[in-house]
């Protein structure tokens, strides 16, 4: 019996990747399982093998084409199934009709760089990766800065409610090491979620000039 102890969650990166996680308490560790994608209006099918990521959780990526190719649109529906081998046959363990542009999670922003740094200020830029041209400018960002002696969880979130791929951090302390991260989210999609955080960018503010108050 399946009594609500399982979860099957997938997201589309807006271009050519659907990432899925399936978890089931009490599942056999050595069972071979896969995710099968079956679009309603396209000729291709795609399968990926679920690989363990924890005791009762498996994940895989459905690679639909070249990373920047636009493989799905807002009108597509893709039936996603979890299939597990039982003896000589495959059994459907879970099923959902997946609307790609209602279930978006973009790739983490890339190419973070310090454009300009001063004693109290730092200008940082980044790029988005593998994001559909359909969004035009309908994206938002969250950023956070790690200060000495604090954790990422304590860092206040800075929200950019538009497609702005730079930020000017102010009121920084001179001659201090910081780290910076950013993530992105489309405005579209009922079940859309934030991208993973970018790789942290480390930077150091300039020392205060000698003989001047800081």
């Amino acid at each position: 019996a399946v009594n609500g102890t399982s979860q099957f969650t997938c997201f589309y990166n807006s271009r050519a990747n659907i990432s899925c996680v399936w978890s089931q308490d009490g599942a056999l560790q050595d069972t071979s399982c896969q995710v099968h994608a079956w679009p309603d209006r396209r000729r291709w099918n795609q399968t990926c093998e679920l690989l363990p990521v924890s005791q009762a959780s498996w994940a895989c990526n459905l690679i639909l084409g070249a990373p920047d190719s636009q493989k799905l649109t807002t009108v597509d529906i893709v039936t996603l199934r979890v299939l597990c081998r039982e003896g000589v046959r495959w059994r459907v363990m879970a099923i959902q009709d997946f609307k790609p542009f209602e279930n978006l999670r973009l790739m983490a922003p890339i190419s973070l760089q310090v454009v300009h740094v001063e004693t109290h200020r730092c200008n940082i830029s980044w790029e988005i990766s593998q994001a559909s041209h359909y969004f035009e400018r309908h994206l938002e960002f969250e950023a956070r800065t790690l200060s000495p002696g604090h954790t990422w969880e304590e860092a206040p979130l800075l929200t950019l409610k538009q497609k702005q791929e730079w930020i000017c951090l102010e009121t920084l302390t001179p001659d201090t090491q910081y780290e910076f991260q950013v993530r992105v989210k489309p405005l579209q999609g009922e079940f859309t979620t934030w991208s993973p955080w970018s790789q942290p960018l480390a930077f150091r503010t300039k020392p205060a000039a000698l003989g001047k108050d800081t």
């Epitope: 399982s6 099957f8 969650t9 039936t79 879970a94 099923i95 959902q96 009709d97 079940f191």
Partner: nanobody, 123 residues
Framework: EVQLVESGGGLVQAGGSLRLSCAAS????????MGWFRQAPGKEREFVVA????????DFPDSVKGRFTISRDNAKNTVYLDMNSLKPEDTAVYYC????????????????WGEGTLVTVSS
Amino acid sequence: EVQLVESGGGLVQAGGSLRLSCAASGRDFSSYAMGWFRQAPGKEREFVVAITWTKRSTDFPDSVKGRFTISRDNAKNTVYLDMNSLKPEDTAVYYCASARGLPVTPLGDIIYWGEGTLVTVSS
């Protein structure tokens, strides 16, 4: 408010047939799978079958394979479970359920349940 209303249950003799219906209302169900669970007296609720908006379905358990079929009328937001050659062991409360994925629900998602309809198969 989302509502799932089952109908069609009742008392039937072994070897007989029933058609269960589940009418859904209160939201757009085009992203949602619909299906059936059942709970026999003194047992845990178990998954029977699910069908998506695009009318693709899961496998039936071996215990009902070849006897039960599922169908869906998207215009009416209704799912049907046709049960033939019924056996006493099919006696249970049959619950309609709807979620983005069945028999499992995605993270953060809510599974909607009906009140259940009782099917009793006498020998």
